[in-house]
């Protein structure tokens, strides 16, 4: 969370940004809020990126002004125009790429004053893991798969029954490069699993952490997955 202040005459305006993460190959959002101003035509929003000449996006007088926009952002950016009056200056970015990572500045000017705040935008790939029972193996084993990660994550297994146990000796993890030659498929196999136990497969890099849980009993298999972005907010 970064809060910036600005002075215009005697007026301070607070601009707040949140460290954000973008999943490459999807649309992303760079979050920025400011003190609301009901006079939409008096609001100017400028997004800038460190090391880039020209603007990422500009919104003023109630509409986009893309005349100074840098080529790498052409056709890819939007503010949430209907939310600007309530203080939302967040930027939507289409088809996030690794090269979009960096330091961005959200600059705001309103009738109350002006201010800005920086935002660190991280880009990578993250996806939900899916755990299945691998019946092909000679002994009962679990297979945890996640289709897209970057940078290369760490993978760890945990068990509800054997809390604190180290499963590195009885698991095997591989990373297979996907066709676009950036992201990788993560596959981890845990051997010698026991029935009536809940196992967790945890995949983590510096952008996201995902966990897949599986409970295998004699009568059923229960699964649950969750994903959280790290250092955001």
């Amino acid at each position: 969370l970064i809060i910036g202040f600005g002075i215009s005459g005697k007026h301070f305006i607070t601009v707040t940004t949140f460290t954000s993460a973008g999943n490459i190959g999807e649309d992303g959002t760079l979050s920025c809020t400011f003190e609301p101003d009901i006079k939409l035509n008096g609001i100017v929003i400028q997004w800038l990126k460190e090391g880039i000449k020209g603007l990422v996006h500009e919104f003023k007088e109630g509409k986009d002004d893309l005349s100074q926009q840098h080529e790498m952002f052409r056709g890819r950016t939007a503010v949430f125009a209907d939310q600007v009056v309530v203080g939302n200056a967040s930027l939507r970015l289409k088809n996030v790429q690794l090269t979009d990572a960096g330091t961005y500045t959200c600059y705001i000017r309103t009738s109350k004053g002006k201010g800005n705040a920086n935002l660190e935008y991280k880009t990578g790939a993250f996806s939900m893991p899916e755990i299945n029972v691998d019946y092909n193996a000679s002994s009962e084993s679990l297979r945890c798969e996640a289709p897209r990660w970057f940078p290369q994550p760490t993978v760890a297994w945990a068990s509800q029954v054997d809390q604190g146990a180290n499963f590195s000796e009885v698991s095997n993890t591989s990373f297979e490069l996907n066709s676009e030659n950036v992201t990788m498929k993560v596959v981890s196999v845990l051997y010698n699993v026991t029935i009536n136990n809940t196992y967790s497969c945890m995949i983590e890099n510096d952008i996201a952490k995902a966990t897949g849980d599986i409970k295998v009993t004699d009568s059923e298999v229960k699964r649950r997955s969750q994903l959280q972005l790290l250092n955001s907010g």
Epitope: I24, T77, R92, R148, E180
Partner: antibody
Framework: EVQLVESGGGLIQPGGSLRLSCAAS????????MNWVRQAPGKGLEWVSV???????DSADSVKGRFTISRDNSKNTLYLQMNSLRAEDTAVYYC??????????WGQGTTVTVSS | EIVLTQSPGTLSLSPGERATLSCRAS???????LAWYQQKPGQAPRLLIY???SRATGIPDRFSGSGSGTDFTLTISRLEPEDFAVYYC??????????FGQGTKLEIK
Amino acid sequence: EVQLVESGGGLIQPGGSLRLSCAASGFIVSRNYMNWVRQAPGKGLEWVSVIYGSGRTDSADSVKGRFTISRDNSKNTLYLQMNSLRAEDTAVYYCARDADYGLDVWGQGTTVTVSS
Amino acid sequence: EIVLTQSPGTLSLSPGERATLSCRASQSVSSSYLAWYQQKPGQAPRLLIYGASSRATGIPDRFSGSGSGTDFTLTISRLEPEDFAVYYCQQYGSSPLYTFGQGTKLEIK
């Protein structure tokens, strides 16, 4: 040369299934947002489905639960699996690439006719 | 859902004249996400303008786009015989993800 070539269209009875294919050349399908857009006879363009670079998909309400977009990265090919077809699905189906700058590459289209 | 309404439905003009086609959105659309296409009978659509005002590769400079917010315009400064076709505006980014206008037919007077 950047190109998209659709195939798989034809005459099908209501309730039937069909799979359309779109072979891409000159670029990598998985790096782009790939779409299916259709055009009923004498009508305008209607977006059907998208598959993002990430592999996530989205579809128009009119086809949700019936049509599934997918891709085979090794074949650099886009697909549209169409189930429970209705007369109102009759159209020319185009695949189209969105390279951030709008739908900049289109296939020639393949015709789907749903009729008994 | 954002609805794009194009006007006029049909525009009858002669070669050499100026054509002005309008696209109005039911709510604000980002200029970045507004595009124009040309479609001739029996052919696939062709991207003309993206980002409301940027010409796509290979598009002649007689085609220009303008506008922001809810009102967008495609202008053809001097009509050539090959310009007579149907023109569609399209937006990206809301639900449904892509929305097209109903089209404007540009015909020879």
